[in-house]
């Protein structure tokens, strides 16, 4: 007869490991007992369990409650055992020693490999600001056994660097993603992808990029100066900018206080019916935590009567 087993049994942390040991005997041969031991190099054999044809299953105190026979029906020639709730410390070499009648004793070894799936973590780097050079956007760390693979999935242009730390029974892998921040990256996803044989599918952690910036400010509303004449209603100036975080707006008049009746509504400056006293230099001040910008415009409120008089003069002059 001969023993049938596996060279390697692979199990995920917390799962049950079946350690196979089947005696393929000739007719009439019987298995008296199967002794399972852990036999790591440099250490003596440590009893795991003894399966006896008459006495049944004996489990070593060190494995009490963790070793069982596979559920029925059982073949009397099958010396396999189940190791419940495999932990990393169970990884190693195991030996089954089968005593048969009349053929004698047989033994076989297998290696138990316990996969420890990683629990990845993503840590954002320092605040990203437009104008910075190459900056850490995020780092992703995953520890497992064997060492996990850590990659990045993103549309954003950047560079990656990885480092690995080996521990006694596992390895930690850290990957960093660096980029040159620009406003176009704002709101873009940066995804850490962790692969490992103990995972049914890759684990993904997504970080949304936030790049602080503030665009140049400009003022809209003076495109047609002829509209800015005495008596006009509904005149307004709008300050244009964008930023992250969203900016706040403030309006001032460079050559004095804002005229009475002028309303400030965020980025918009609303005028009452125009008079000449609304003429002046207006400043839009845009700011966020990252920066501030100013844009100024000159408002010149026209008097239609003056204009028509001049026209008459010009005509008469011709």
């Amino acid at each position: 007869g001969e023993l049938e087993t596996s060279d390697v049994v692979t199990v995920v942390l917390g799962q049950d490991a079946k350690l196979p040991c089947f005696y393929r005997g000739d007719s009439g041969e019987q298995v008296g007992q199967v002794a399972w031991a852990r036999v790591d190099a440099g250490e003596g054999a440590q009893e795991l369990a003894l399966l006896h044809s008459k006495y049944g299953l004996h489990v070593s105190p060190a494995y009490e409650g963790r070793v069982e026979q596979p559920p029925p029906p059982r073949n009397p020639l099958d010396g396999s055992v189940l190791l419940r709730n495999a932990v990393q410390a169970d990884e190693g070499e195991y030996e089954c020693r089968v005593s048969t009648f009349p053929a004698g004793s047989f033994q076989a070894r297998l290696r138990l490999r316990v996969l420890v799936p990683p629990l990845p973590s993503l840590n954002p780097g320092p605040a990203l600001e437009e104008g910075q050079g190459l900056t850490l956007a995020a780092s992703c760390t995953a520890e497992g056994s064997p060492a996990p693979s850590v990659t990045w999935d993103t549309e954003v242009k950047g560079t990656t660097s990885s480092r690995s730390f080996k521990h006694s029974r596992s390895a930690a892998v850290t990957s960093e993603f660096h980029l040159v921040p620009s406003r176009s990256m704002n709101g873009q996803p940066l995804t850490c992808v962790v692969s490992h044989p103990g995972l049914l599918q890759d684990q993904r952690i997504t970080h949304i990029l936030h790049v602080s910036f503030l665009a140049e400010a400009s003022v809209r509303g003076l495109e047609d100066q002829n509209l800015w004449h005495i008596g006009r209603e509904g005149a307004m100036l709008k300050c244009l900018s964008e930023g992250q975080p969203p900016p706040s707006y403030n309006w001032t008049r460079l050559d004095g206080p804002l005229p009475s009746g002028v309303r400030v509504d965020g980025d918009t400056l609303g005028f009452p019916p125009l008079t000449t006293e609304h003429s002046g230099i207006y400043v839009c001040h845009v700011s966020n935590e990252f920066s501030s910008r100013d844009s100024q415009v000159t408002v010149d409120v026209l008097d239609p009567q003056e204009d028509s008089g001049k026209q008459v003069d010009l005509v008469s002059a011709s």
Partner: antibody
């Protein structure tokens, strides 16, 4: 025929010592683990100590640990129990018995027993 | 240590009676259980090993059953020579421990 014959029992004062012997015949002595089991007068059976076939492993009940020593001489087919610091509660018939090693520290039931030797601890 | 609880502690029966003695272990011991018979002034004698295997030379009226924690010794038809004290013993762990015994007396 398997035979186990105990000797060495007798009357001893509390605090005294005694050495019991068990002569074995009719089987390959070194292939079997051996045990001492005692029975106080009118009481049940109490396991005392055991030793592996080679003598490399010894086991003791908590009640005798540090006072009793089990040993064997495979060349003489003899099992011993050295009993020191004897107490009144050690009074009992002491039996030797044999058992087979299955594997590791797992043994069969004791299939053969000696006739016993009486140890009386009294002042 | 594993505690072995035997019941009853004594019983009276007549020749020809069917006698059942039970033994309970405080934890699972698979079939690492033996039954012994002891007569006054004599050494214990192994009747049953591995919970249900009959020791060579023991009459077939003796039988054992059970595994795990609950075990039974049955004498199918009590004979005059069977009046004795019966002990169960576990040898799953060290120290091996005995039940307190069951004395079978003549009714």
């Amino acid at each position: 025929e398997v035979q186990l014959v105990e000797s060495g029992g007798g009357l001893v004062q509390p605090g005294g010592s005694l050495r019991l012997s068990c002569a074995a015949s009719g089987f390959t002595f070194s292939s079997y683990a051996m045990s001492w089991v005692r029975q106080a007068p009118g009481k049940g059976l109490e396991w005392v100590s055991a030793i592996s076939g080679s003598g490399g492993s010894t086991y003791y009940a908590d009640s005798v640990k540090g006072r009793f020593t089990i040993s064997r001489d495979n060349s003489k087919n003899t099992l011993y129990l050295q009993m020191n610091s004897l107490r009144a509660e050690d009074t009992a018939v002491y039996y030797c018995a044999r058992a087979e090693l299955l594997a590791f520290d797992v043994y069969t039931a004791s299939d053969y027993w000696g006739q016993g030797t009486l140890v009386t601890v009294s002042s | 240590d594993i505690q072995m609880t035997q019941s009853p502690s004594s019983l009276s029966a007549s020749v020809g009676d069917r006698v059942t003695i039970t033994c309970r272990a405080s934890q699972g011991i698979s079939s690492y259980l033996a039954w012994y018979q002891q007569k006054p002034g004599k050494a214990p004698k192994l009747l049953i090993y591995a919970a249900s295997s009959l020791q060579s030379g023991v009459p077939s009226r003796f039988s054992g059953s059970g595994s795990g924690t609950d075990f039974t010794l049955t004498i199918s038809s009590l004979q005059p020579e069977d009046f004795a004290t019966y002990y169960c013993q576990q040898h799953y762990t060290t120290p091996p421990t005995f039940g307190q015994g069951t004395k079978v007396e003549i009714k």
